[in-house]
């Protein structure tokens, strides 16, 4: 190799200056004894190279790019060789930003997959390869004192969420959890969450059903619906409150909310609806009175209210 580039830093803050040096060895005898070293950033020639002959006979050109405004570019030094430009060496330059503090870190405990799923917002684009790591530890108290560290959780590329499996969790005990972001320009850490995985539990919703008409039960009145629900079995022993929502199937009506209902109600008569109208109903639940996350809304149940009974006009005869 006849030439070699060295740079002050191959990765800089976007807009920062960068200094580069290109040295041409003396033993490249086929070259012009006083060659003019040229600089190119991407496809553009860059003026301003200061060239000098060193005591050992090598030629050096130094250039300062006042602002590197490209997030990625190749810087090359070259010589005119006949009618063409002979590239001696090139380096990749990267520019970007250090990672912003990850924010809006939140977690939920999924009892079916037995994992604590945490997600966050990574902040603005850094233009550099940036790694995120979900870090955590077990704590007996309120996370002021750190207990056993938990294996780092590294999300798949481009994802802003990570799952901590059950074997690294202790239920009914606090955990300190935070996200660390790192790239070539720096490291940042989100504020730490301190939580008991059970306090962020997200249950599955109950299954809505039509109430089976029993011979002794009165049929629903006009504008009423009788429905029941089957609790999600794995969450059966968790105290919960639930809420229903309903809307007519036709038209543009928005959802109407009914609640809170205790999960234990298991059946409900919903009144005040339009008679002879098809309704869509859904239910969701949350651990309560202890903390938790609302479940998703259940699959829809579609039911029709009964018709209003015909009104009988009684004619009174006066004698």
């Amino acid at each position: 190799e006849c030439g070699h580039i060295s740079v002050s830093a191959p990765i800089v803050h976007l807009g920062d200056p960068i200094t580069a040096s290109c040295i041409i060895k003396q033993n490249c005898s086929h070259l012009d004894p006083e060659p003019q070293i040229l600089w190119r950033l991407g496809a553009e020639l860059q003026p301003g190279g200061r060239q000098q002959r060193l005591s050992d006979g090598t030629q050096e050109s130094i250039i300062t790019l006042p602002h590197l405004n490209h997030t990625q570019a190749f810087l090359s030094c070259a010589l005119n060789w006949g009618n063409s430009l002979q590239i001696l060496d090139q380096v990749e330059l990267r520019a970007g930003y250090p990672p912003a503090i990850p924010h809006n870190l939140s977690c939920l405990m999924n009892l079916t997959t037995s994992s604590l799923i945490c997600q966050w917002e990574p902040g603005p684009e850094t233009h550099l390869p940036t790694s995120f790591t979900l870090k955590s530890f077990k704590s007996r108290g309120n996370c002021q004192t750190q207990g056993d560290s938990i294996l780092d959780c590294v999300p798949k590329d481009g994802q802003s969420h990570c799952s901590i499996p059950r074997k690294h969790l202790l239920l009914y005990q606090n955990m300190g959890i935070w996200v660390q972001a790192e790239n070539a320009l720096g490291t940042s850490m989100s504020p730490q969450l301190c939580l008991d995985p059970m306090d962020v539990v997200k249950l599955e919703p109950p299954m809505l059903r039509t109430m089976d008409p029993s011979p002794e039960a009165a049929p629903p009145q006009a504008g009423c619906l009788q429905l029941s629900w089957e609790p999600w079995q794995p969450g059966l022993h968790i105290n919960q409150k639930c809420e229903l929502r309903h809307k007519p199937q036709r038209g543009e009506a928005s959802w109407a909310l009914v609640g809170p209902l205790p999960l234990e109600a298991l059946q409900y008569e919903l009144c005040g609806l339009l008679p002879a109208t098809a309704y869509t109903l859904q239910i969701r639940c949350i651990r309560w009175p202890l903390p938790g996350h609302w479940s998703d809304w259940s699959p829809s149940l579609e039911l029709r209210t009964t018709e209003r009974a015909p009104t009988h006009h009684h004619h009174h005869h006066h004698h």
Partner: antibody, heavy 118, light 107 residues
Framework: EVQLLESGGGLVQPGGSLRLSCAAS????????MGWVRQAPGKGLEWVSS????????PYADSVKGRFTISRDNSKNTLYLQMNSLRAEDTAVYYC???????????WGQGTLVTVSS | DIQMTQSPSSLSASVGDRVTITCRAS??????LNWYQQKPGKAPKLLIY???NLQNGVPSRFSGSGSGTDFTLTISSLQPEDFATYYC?????????FGGGTKVEIK
């Protein structure tokens, strides 16, 4: 300290009835599911029934469905098991249990023996 | 109903031995598997809940693992007070069901 104290066991004839009680202390009784588990002499554990914190949900084992009724009085911190139409195979030590949110039995009473025999 | 099959039904071991008891569910139960220890004439005692969570006050030589249908209780170094009968129990759905038990005896 959590304490569960069963009472009401004894000798009863087949077809007879018995009511077991479990007095609870040391925790907020009204917030927990409670249950009954039995163990026949020399045998393993068998879940009988559970009851939700306010009494609205009461699953039963098939072997006792329609004959046993679980109930609770949160004002008295007491769990009950009304056992009717008793059979010889109901002979067992009956344990009262405080259940955790994941269905595990956090605490157990010392048990009360029910013997069904003529 | 979910059936729970425990094995072995009994085993002989010495103090200091590593002991492993397995429990298999007839269908997937996620992590809803609990382990209890019972000594003669006494009520059962909770050791492990939700497959791997050690109940407060239980020595760390007890550990649980597994998910889905296959679960394991391990006693890393058997102590004299550990000779007892051990039961697994699923709490994924009612009826709650127990395994048949494993009696750990002194060799």
């Amino acid at each position: 300290e959590v304490q569960l104290l069963e009472s009401g066991g004894g000798l009863v004839q087949p077809g007879g009835s018995l009511r077991l009680s479990c007095a609870a202390s040391g925790f907020t009784f009204s917030l927990y599911w409670m249950g009954w588990v039995r163990q026949a002499p020399g045998k393993g554990l068998e879940w009988v029934s559970s009851i939700s914190s306010s009494g609205g949900v009461t699953p039963y084992a098939d072997s006792v469905k329609g004959r046993f009724t679980i109930s609770r009085d949160n004002s008295k911190n007491t769990l009950y098991l009304q056992m009717n139409s008793l059979r010889a195979e109901d002979t067992a030590v009956y344990y009262c249990a405080k259940l955790g949110e994941l269905g595990h039995s956090l605490a157990w009473g010392q048990g009360t023996l029910v013997t069904v025999s003529s | 109903d979910i059936q729970m099959t425990q094995s072995p039904s009994s085993l002989s071991a010495s103090v200091g031995d590593r002991v492993t008891i397995t429990c298999r569910a007839s269908q997937g139960i996620s992590s809803y598997l609990n382990w209890y220890q019972q000594k003669p004439g006494k009520a059962p005692k909770l050791l492990i809940y939700y497959a791997s969570n050690l109940q407060n006050g239980v020595p760390s030589r007890f550990s649980g693992s597994g998910s889905g249908t296959d679960f394991t209780l391990t006693i890393s170094s058997l102590q004299p007070e550990d000779f007892a009968t051990y039961y697994c129990q699923q709490s994924y759905s009612t009826p709650l069901t127990f395994g048949g038990g494993t009696k750990v005896e002194i060799k």
